[in-house]
Interface confidence: low
């Protein structure tokens, strides 16, 4: 590290006094201090003096040595006081730039270092500082305003007490600009619009930064369009609004609205569609299929998309049947907007009962008529069986009579021993019946089918079991003969004799 | 047409100026930012300022900064930029473009020549 | 400042090839604001693609561009005989928008 002699952190001298410094070092050294005339500047290798036969006030300031070479990058420095009694200050600049929310220096340095307890800042004509200014003062580098604020771009002046009186330093102007942090702030109202061709249509195009360098524009499909701009200025932001009007569209206005807005940091834009259309419309649709299968006991949530212009003015849920007269109830069905012109409705029916299957339909009604979506509901049931002995053209015939939705497909066992359920180990023969026939298959209810084992000798220590089985599950029923006649055996039940 | 037209290059030596111009056809030319871009002799691109539609707001490269003053009359369709203290370094085609404000730069001049040589 | 690099510098390619050239950014180019341009000798730039894969009004199909963040690339999916220029990338976002140093496409 360099050293000053003499080594002292603070000189005070008279106007036209001789001041020598001088700056020693182990390489090369170099001063470095505040613009002034009169200085001198000597240097020998390792050594350097500054030196002036006739200080002044403008001689003020702090003086730097460093050694180039030197890689930890140390230096030296002392500060110089010409104490003039006519100039109290010595300003180094008389305007300085800065940043919102950085600190500013005025650079007026105190010339004698006793009249420090009587300094202070005052804008220029004698005006106080704004409220809320927070500043502080050092005699060797001036007052720094903390944190300064646009609104604090002002003229200054340093003020020192002199001999009972204030005594100004010339005028420092602080320029404190905005920080831009990108290009402008950019809304485009409506973000989508639709017109019947004769209608008014506003499309507006708005812009705000913290600084009012910059441009907007409004431009339909590519064509930059020619519309007064308004400007204001709230909230500290510089707003620009251009508002297109159109009076009575047409298929021409139709097409991409951009609006573009650029400052010196870049651009931003945004775009919306302007659709024109010959008259009102109203299109339902659902992503889902509109026959819906659900098991008994489940939920299920029926979804229709509604795109309409002119906006909706009723719509509903009904239930068309078939088994009763109930109506969906108005707080399982909601709505929810996606759009201006695109809406979904939902209908929740949770736990299906058996008479909740049938058809429901969405109605939704907009100067352009009425539409309806309809939606199919099945329910689905595991099969119910039931099993009866009886004599068909003279030979005994069991008789299995299953009933489900999807239609059940039927097996018939024979296995030893009298059993509730035939087990893997006790079966002694299996038959398919591919054909079971269809007693009843009516719309949204369970299809019944009828399969026929025809039995010529009913073995009485077997049992005969029919089982039925979809989608959703299965079911059975055994058949056990004894001599008292022929028993059934429901699964879960005990024998019983009729 | 949509077009753009530089005139003003020549030959000037170093320390010299000159002004270049750029004629805008065939667009509301106030509605754009305008940018210079120039070229040296076998080299790529280098931007080299932008002036905003309104003439608001201007932009330098830092090789260019106090030397380069760029400006415009949108009552003449008309860009300008000036070269003051030119050097060897500051020799190449100088291109204007247009800035649609939606990406890239759409159109540009056919360029004017800028040499600086003694 | 964002600095762009092209590679590769030139490249030798025969019609009909696909020809892939990529654009690096020392950093992230936001909201993929990057444009490629083709220049000829002695013309001026002409604009291809902006925000990274829009493609000009105009320009062939066979001209696409793909990327986002640091990495960008220009493809020429089947190379035609006008295809032959020096390609440039470039970023307008922010200032001061800068260009790769150019991909120079010669005929093999």
């Known amino acids: 590290i360099p050293v000053i002699e003499p080594s002292v952190p603070e000189l005070v001298v008279k106007p036209g006094a001789t001041v020598t410094l001088r700056c020693v070092g182990n390489g090369s050294v170099e001063w470095d201090g505040p613009p002034s005339p009169h200085w001198t500047l000597y240097s020998d290798g390792s050594s350097s003096i500054l030196s002036t036969n006739n200080a002044t006030f403008q001689n003020t300031g702090t003086y730097r040595c460093t050694e180039p070479g030197d890689p930890l990058g140390g230096s030296a420095a002392i500060h110089l006081y010409v104490k003039d009694p006519a100039r109290p200050w010595n300003v180094l600049a008389q305007e300085v730039v800065v940043f919102e929310d950085q600190d500013a220096l005025l650079p007026c340095l105190l010339t004698d270092p006793v009249l420090e307890a009587g300094v202070s800042l005052v804008r220029v004509r004698g005006r106080p500082l704004m409220r809320h200014t927070n500043y502080s003062f050092s005699p060797w580098h001036g007052f720094t305003i903390h944190r300064a604020k646009f609104i604090q771009s002002q003229d200054y002046q340093c003020s020192a007490l002199m001999g009972g009186r204030k005594v100004m330093s010339i005028s420092i102007r602080l320029k404190v600009q905005k920080v831009i942090p990108g290009p402008p702030a950019l809304t485009l109202v409506p973000a989508e619009l639709v017109r019947i061709r004769g209608e008014a249509a506003q499309i507006v195009c708005s812009a705000s930064s913290v600084d009012v360098n910059f441009d907007v524009f409004l431009q339909h499909n590519n064509t930059k369009l020619a519309i007064p701009q308004q400007s204001d200025f709230h909230n500290n932001r510089y707003q620009k609004v251009l508002t297109l009007n159109l009076d009575q569209v047409d298929f021409q206005h139709a097409g991409n609205y951009s609006c573009v807005a650029s400052n010196v940091q870049g651009k931003h834009s945004t775009s919306m569609f302007f659709r024109v259309v010959e008259s009102a419309y109203l299109n339902l649709s659902s992503e889902q299929n509109l026959i819906q299968e659900v098991t008994v006991g489940e939920g299920l949530n029926l979804k229709v998309m509604v795109e309409a212009y002119p906006g909706l003015q009723g719509f509903n849920w009904t239930y068309l049947g078939p088994f009763s007269d109930h109506q969906p109830e108005p707080k399982l069905a909601n709505a929810t907007t996606k759009d201006t012109y695109r809406h979904t409705f939902t209908l929740s029916l949770p736990r299906l009962k058996p008479s909740e299957a049938g058809r429901y339909s969405f109605l939704a009604r907009n100067p352009g008529g009425w539409r309806a979506l309809t939606f199919e509901l099945t329910l689905r049931y595991p099969p119910e069986v039931s099993v009866i002995w009886t004599f068909i053209n003279g030979s005994g015939t069991l008789l299995c009579a299953a009933s489900g939705y999807p239609q059940p497909n039927v097996t018939w066992l024979q296995c030893s021993g009298h059993t509730d359920r035939c087990d893997e180990a006790q079966v002694l023969q299996v038959w398919d019946d591919p054909y079971p026939e269809v007693l009843s298959q009516e719309p949204f209810h369970k299809v019944t089918v009828q399969s026929l084992l025809t039995v010529e000798t009913l073995e009485h220590n077997q049992t005969y079991e029919c089982r039925a089985h979809n989608s959703v599950g299965s079911g059975s029923w055994a058949f056990i003969p004894i001599s008292a006649g022929a028993h059934t055996h429901p699964p879960d039940e005990f024998l019983f004799t009729p | 047409e949509v077009q753009l037209v530089e005139s003003g290059g020549g030959l000037v030596q170093p320390g010299g100026s000159l002004r270049l111009s750029c004629a805008a056809s065939?667009?509301?030319?106030?509605?754009?930012?305008i940018h210079w871009v120039r070229q040296a002799p076998g080299k790529g691109l280098e931007w080299v300022s932008v002036?905003?539609?309104?003439?608001?707001?201007?932009y330098y490269a830092d090789s260019v900064k106090g030397r380069f003053t760029i400006s415009r009359d949108n009552s003449k369709n008309t860009l300008y930029l000036q070269l003051n203290s030119l050097r060897a370094e500051d020799t190449a085609v100088y291109y204007c473009?247009?800035?649609?404000?939606?990406?890239?730069?759409?159109?540009w001049g056919q360029g004017t020549l800028v040499t600086v040589s003694s | 400042d964002i600095q762009l690099t092209q590679s590769p510098s030139s490249l030798s390619a025969s019609v009909g090839d696909r020809v892939t050239i990529t654009c690096r950014a020392s950093q992230s180019v936001r909201r993929r604001f990057l444009a490629w341009y083709q220049q000829k000798p002695g013309k001026a730039p002409k604009l291809l693609i902006y925000?990274?894969?829009s493609l000009e009004s105009g320009v062939p199909s066979r001209f696409s561009g793909s990327g986002s963040g640091t990495d960008f690339t220009l493809t020429i999916s089947s190379l035609q005989p006008e295809d032959f220029a020096t390609y440039y990338c470039q970023q307008y976002y922010p200032i001061p928008r800068t260009f790769g140093q150019g991909t120079k496409v010669e005929i093999k």
């Open positions: 925000d990274a894969s």
């Open positions: 002036i905003s539609g309104y003439g608001s707001s201007t």
């Open positions: 473009a247009r800035d649609p404000g939606v990406g890239g730069f759409d159109v």
């Open positions: 065939g667009f509301t030319f106030s509605g754009y930012a």
